[in-house]
Each structure stands twice: as C-alpha cells, then as structure tokens.
Interface confidence: low
C-alpha cells in the first residue's frame, strides 16, 4: 500500500535530514521504517507528526527493541519523565521520589528522601526498641508519687548522608512509682519541704476564699 | 494465524470477583501488548487496562483500583480480575492483541464473553 | 476527560459515498493516532483503519481514512457501499488511556 509508494521513492528524499537513518521515507511523514539499530520515534509539531529514526530515545521515552523494527514507547511509569526501560524508571515527575526505578511521593520505611536528586537513598537503619526502663526520678525508685522511664534503641547502620538523620534513638515517659514512699519511712528532705509549702499554699488559698466570699455577701447586703 | 479465546464464567453476583481468561495462540504473549476491552449493552466500549510483552500493566484510571491483568507465560494466556463488581459491570467482554505503542490499535479481537452480574 | 463524539447514524444508498466523523472534545486530532473499527450484527470488532489513514491487508480500498483539523476530527470514508458495510463503526485515539468514540449505525437505504 502506501509503504510501497514510498520505498520506491525513497531516492528523492535521501538528502531530506528527517530521512537519516530511513529506510522507508516521505516528505510529508519522514520515515516510518528504520535502519537496524536505530529507534522510530514519532515526533509530534503542532498538528503534524512525522516519523524520525535516533540512535537514542529522547526524555519521556525508552528504546522498545522488536524483531520489525526498534520504537521509541512513552514511559508508562506512573509519575515517571524518563525511563531506561518498560518498567525502570530513571527520574520521576517534580515532587516524587526515586526508588528501584519507580516513582513515590514519600520514600517506603527505611529510606530516606534525598532532596538534591530527588532519590530514596538508604537512611538511617535503627533496631527495635529495648523494654522500657524502671520508674524513677533523681535516680531514685522511691519517694515520689510521679517518674519517668526510658527506652532506647541503637543505630544498626549508618545512613549513606550526613545530612540524612537518624529517628530518636531514646523516648521517655511519664509514669507512677511503684512505691511512693521508700523503705524505712524515710522521706526526703526536699519532699518533706515540698509538702510544708503545699500546706501552707492551701491555707492561703482557703483564707482567700473565705475573704472573697465575705466580700461578696457584704456587696450584696449593701 | 493468530487467535485468541475468552472464556470465564457467564454470571457473576454482585459484590463478587470477576476472573477471565485469554488465551492466545499463534503469538507468544511475550512478544506483544494485550488489552482486555468490554461493550457494555447499549454498544458502548471501553478499554480496560493492558499487559505489554514484558508483564508491565497500564489501566483505565476510571478501574483502577478495581482491575487487575496478570498472565501466566507457560500457558500462554492472559488474564482480567475485575474486584466489587455490579450490575453496571454486565458486558461482553473482548481481549485483544494492542499494536506497539505509539500507534494504539487492535487489530486481532477475540469473539467475546457475554457477562452477566445479577443476584 | 477525553471524549470522542461520533454521528449516532448515518444512511447511503448502494454504490454511494458516505463520511463518518470521530471529533476530539479536547486537544488537536493529530496528537494521538485514530483507528476505525466496524462490528457487524454483535460479532467482534474488526480493524479498518490504523495511523489515520492506513489500511490492513484484507480490507477493501473502499475504506479510507483521514483527518480534518479543522473540525478537530479523524474521518472514515467508505465509497461505493456495498450491502456488508450495513453495521456499528467506532473510532479509537488517546495515549496512555485509549477512548473509543460513541458509535455510529452505518444503514443502507
């Protein structure tokens, strides 16, 4: 059909530049079948398309070879600009991330996003969480009502970037004395200090009150 | 001469998994894209989603999380699992053998499974 | 979302000339290819036209296709119809999600 037309025409437009590499050429759709090696890739200006062979597949494209003929085929990637194949993406779309050749809005656990290329590189690799620790507050286990315990956990494997940071490697928590007084009887002498000042600040308060409470009764009868 | 063959259940109840075959002879699956397109009652088609030489899929991003094509390369067949169906999803189903991109076209159809989803 | 927008009939008389149009809601025609396809009494579709303009082998030179930018529109033309052209043809373009258009009933007068 219309390939025949153009094979036997295909000497008036070899010094045509769209018809390098052709094997099959016109002048109104450039090539449509390649030399070995080279790549088909349709180019598309405004509403005309035109038949181009390239050595290479430009950006959004990767080199699909077939017994026929070599094509450049668009990356099907989701969120992928440039591919090195079907299905390995080479840089993704503004705002994603690179991994194993895909495309991810946030790096999968364990790596970390690598902001000047955009990449998921290895991050910082942290083991599991050691129990939680005693109760305790000034090193001691006894003589408060309220303490903190801490877990911990250690660094496995260093991230591959010193700017990549590592997850907190040590938590704390607010949590109740298991005895509240120590043995012996014995308290502190802070504590004892303490609870003297919150005797004293009660009665202030209750005085207070008391005031508050004859003044308004005294409004109130006036 | 290549030719291919659905084959599947007829009926399917609604809420339930659709599972289709397509099996392809003449043409290793690995040496071409395939399509799975339905014709919904009133004529109207649509395509599915794709699997292409390699075992990379693409789909219509109104299925998405619903479809999905795998294929099994020994026996050379294809296949659509189609997840929650209902009865909007009463069609006869094609597959079809897609000519390499850029060109987008079928030109090899199989004859079709008639799909019904009722309860 | 991509749509494309075909005549829902059309009727000729034998050994005539008809057009079928596939407009494109949104973009240029020329930006993805157009493919034909015709189905006869609910049997499977059967391709007509790829690339725009270009014919399988086995189906007759009376088929032809081509493209009208100015009505954003991919056009099949059959001439000198003959009784077995009577059935649906649909067109299909898009790139990474293939759309087929609405259909059109070809009827012999």
């Known amino acids: 059909q219309g390939n025949r037309w153009r094979r036997s025409k295909r000497a008036s437009y070899v010094s045509n530049p769209i018809c390098k590499g052709c094997l099959s050429c016109s002048k109104d759709n450039g090539c449509s079948r390649c030399q070995q090696k080279l790549f088909f890739f349709l180019r598309r200006e405004g509403m005309r398309q035109y038949g181009e062979c390239l050595h290479s597949c430009p950006s959004g494209y990767y080199g699909h070879r077939a017994p026929d003929m070599n094509r450049c085929a668009r990356c099907r990637i989701e969120n992928c600009d440039s591919c090195f194949s079907k299905d390995f993406c080479t840089k993704c779309k503004v705002g994603f991330y690179l991994h194993r050749g895909r495309c991810f809005d946030e790096c999968p656990d364990g790596f970390a996003p690598l902001e000047e290329t955009m990449e998921c590189v290895e991050g910082c690799e942290v083991g599991h969480w050691s129990e939680w620790g005693t109760c305790s507050r000034n090193n001691r286990t006894c003589g408060f009502k309220w303490g903190l315990e801490t877990r911990t956990r250690q660094i496995v494997k260093k991230p591959v970037k010193d700017t990549i940071l590592c997850p907190t490697i040590a938590e704390s928590r607010r949590c109740k004395m298991t005895m509240r007084h120590c043995p012996g009887g014995k308290r502190t002498p802070k504590a004892k200090e303490k609870r003297n000042k919150k005797k004293k600040r009660k009665l202030i308060e209750r005085a207070q009150e008391q005031h508050s409470v004859f003044l308004a009764t005294d409004r109130a009868n006036q | 001469q290549i030719q291919l063959q659905e084959s599947g259940p007829g009926l399917v109840k609604p809420s339930q998994s659709l599972s289709l075959t397509c099996s392809v002879t003449?043409?290793?699956?690995?040496?071409?894209?395939w399509s799975w397109i339905r014709q919904f009652p009133g004529k109207k088609l649509e395509w599915m989603g794709y699997?292409?030489?390699?075992?990379?899929?693409y789909y219509n991003p109104s299925l998405e999380n619903r479809i999905s094509i795998t294929r099994d390369t020994s026996k050379n067949q294809f296949f659509l699992h189609l997840k929650s169906v209902t009865t909007e999803d009463t069609a006869t189903y094609y597959c079809?053998?897609?000519?390499?991109?850029?060109?987008?076209?079928?030109?090899?159809w199989g004859q079709g499974i008639q799909v019904t989803v009722s309860s | 979302e991509l749509v494309f927008t075909q005549p829902q009939s059309v009727s000729g008389s034998l050994g005539q000339e008809i057009s079928i149009s596939c407009t494109r809601s949104?973009?240029?025609?020329?930006?993805?290819?157009v493919s034909w396809y015709q189905q006869q009494s609910s049997n499977k579709p059967r391709l007509l036209i790829y690339k725009f303009d270009q014919r399988p082998s086995g189906v007759p030179d009376r088929f032809s296709g081509s493209t009208d930018s100015s009505s954003n529109s991919g056009i099949l033309t059959i001439s000198r119809l003959q009784p077995e052209d009577e059935g649906d043809y649909y067109c299909l373009s898009g790139y990474d999600k293939y759309v087929f258009g609405s259909g059109t009933q070809l009827t012999l007068l």
């Open positions: 003449g043409n290793s699956i690995t040496s071409s894209d």
């Open positions: 699997m292409n030489y390699g075992g990379g899929t």
């Open positions: 949104s973009g240029n025609i020329g930006s993805n290819y």
């Open positions: 079809a053998r897609e000519r390499p991109h850029p060109y987008a076209y079928f030109d090899v």
